[in-house]
């Protein structure tokens, strides 16, 4: 059944302590030039959370259940895209649907390509499920061809 | 190639504090989980915690809350393990190790023999 | 938190013999299809190794004598022919659930 973050433990049985983060893809930092100037590839991915409900909550910031979700997605990707040229990602969004997660993963360009980047997510699912008690579905992984402009960004590996 | 080196033994006297190492190489040190494994003398294995240095999450078994405190400095790529008050009973050998989602612990440091004795 | 017990303690053996070492698991450590469930071995005065990650994936530069098997509750480590260096301790980890939990061990020593 699905349950809330506020029942949601980092890790079961422990103690944890989180201190975020990393600093946000944003349009000061990283051109929004198209990619061959820039050297950065962008992707599109969307994935279901079926364990978890979505609320109102998700729709602000500055809840601790947003908070807690985005610092815990944030932190997936470093262990994900560990090999190198993952610089972060940005646009985080959560959406009805148990929780649908929106959010755009930024590469140095020629380091990796959409079916890699599906890849890897979908041989995390187990470790998401055991570190962080998230059920992951329905990943889908597209390019992002056109600049746009990163904002809201949830976190770039320091 | 990976490696994780460990600072060398030490001897205390209880109630001394004592901060142990662990710097790794030859990998993206902040992507990975390091671990802390405790092994008191002829026993076996037991998990401590853990940090992940990109974000300085940190994870303890409840056994050991409140009695150790797990810390990184990522510029320098080093784990550390640290006492306020040692007691005899915190002598052992500890081990630091990576922790990758794929296959659990599969690095290890060579081992810190902390002795604790007045 | 899963508690691994490990058997026999201690198994006597002469090289050339097959051992078998088994870990049960105080509850299921399977999730989608994967185990996680992984096998260690240690010699005195060294730092563990790992042999076996995912009930049953031989680690990089471990001799395709060890093997794994297993899944749910309970795993098997298998060393089909034993060489003098194989004597040690072998643990069983789990990390399904926080905290991570190691078996007892299970100390394989010459006959």
């Known amino acids: 059944t699905p349950t809330t973050l506020a029942s949601h433990s980092t890790k079961t049985d422990a103690s944890s302590t989180h201190h975020s983060s990393v600093p946000p893809l944003t349009s000061s930092n990283h051109s929004t030039s198209p990619q061959l100037s820039t050297g950065v590839s962008f992707f599109f991915l969307s994935f279901h959370i079926s364990n978890l409900q979505f609320n109102s909550s998700l729709e602000d910031p500055s809840t601790d259940y947003y908070q807690e979700l985005q610092r815990d997605i944030s932190e997936m990707f470093l262990q994900i895209y560990k090999q190198g040229g993952f610089l972060g990602l940005s646009n985080i969004k959560f959406r009805p649907g148990s929780v649908v997660v929106q959010l755009t993963l930024a590469f140095r360009e020629g380091t990796i390509n959409v079916h890699d980047v599906e890849t890897q997510f979908n041989q995390y699912k187990t470790e998401a499920a055991s570190r962080y008690n998230l059920t992951i579905s329905d990943v889908s992984v597209s390019d992002v061809p056109f600049p746009f402009s990163a904002q809201s960004g949830a976190g770039v590996p320091g | 190639e990976v490696q994780l080196v460990q600072s060398g033994a030490e001897v205390k006297k209880p109630g001394e504090s004592l901060k142990i190492s662990c710097k790794g190489s030859?990998?993206?040190?902040?992507?990975?989980?390091i671990e802390w494994v405790r092994q008191m003398p002829g026993k076996g294995l037991e998990w401590m915690g853990e940090?992940?240095?990109?974000?300085?999450?940190?994870n303890y078994n409840e056994k050991f809350k409140g009695q150790v405190t797990i810390s990184a400095d990522k510029s320098i790529s080093t784990a550390y393990l640290q006492w306020s008050s040692l007691k005899a009973s915190d002598t052992a050998m500890y081990y630091c190790?990576?922790?990758?989602?794929?296959?659990?612990?599969?690095?290890w440091g060579q081992g810190t023999l902390v002795t604790v004795s007045s | 938190e899963i508690v691994l017990t490990q058997s026999p303690a201690t198994l006597s053996l002469s090289p050339g013999e097959r051992a078998t070492l088994s870990c049960r698991a105080s509850?299921?450590?399977?999730?989608?299809?994967?185990?996680?469930m992984h096998w260690y071995q240690q010699k005195p005065g060294q730092a563990p190794r790992l042999l076996i990650y995912?009930?049953?994936n031989v680690e990089t530069g471990i001799p395709a004598r060890f093997s794994g098997s297993g899944s749910g509750t309970d795993f098997t480590l298998t060393i089909s022919s034993l060489e003098p260096e194989d004597f040690a301790v072998y643990y069983c980890?789990?990390?399904?659930?926080?905290?991570?939990?190691f078996g007892q061990g299970t100390k394989v020593e010459i006959k």
């Open positions: 940090i992940l240095p990109g974000t300085g999450s940190t």
């Open positions: 995912g009930a049953s």
């Open positions: 980890q789990q990390n399904w659930k926080v905290p991570w939990t």
């Open positions: 030859g990998f993206t040190f902040n992507y990975f989980w």
């Open positions: 509850e299921s450590v399977q999730y989608s299809g994967t185990s996680l």
């Open positions: 190790a990576r922790y990758d989602y794929t296959s659990s612990m599969d690095y």
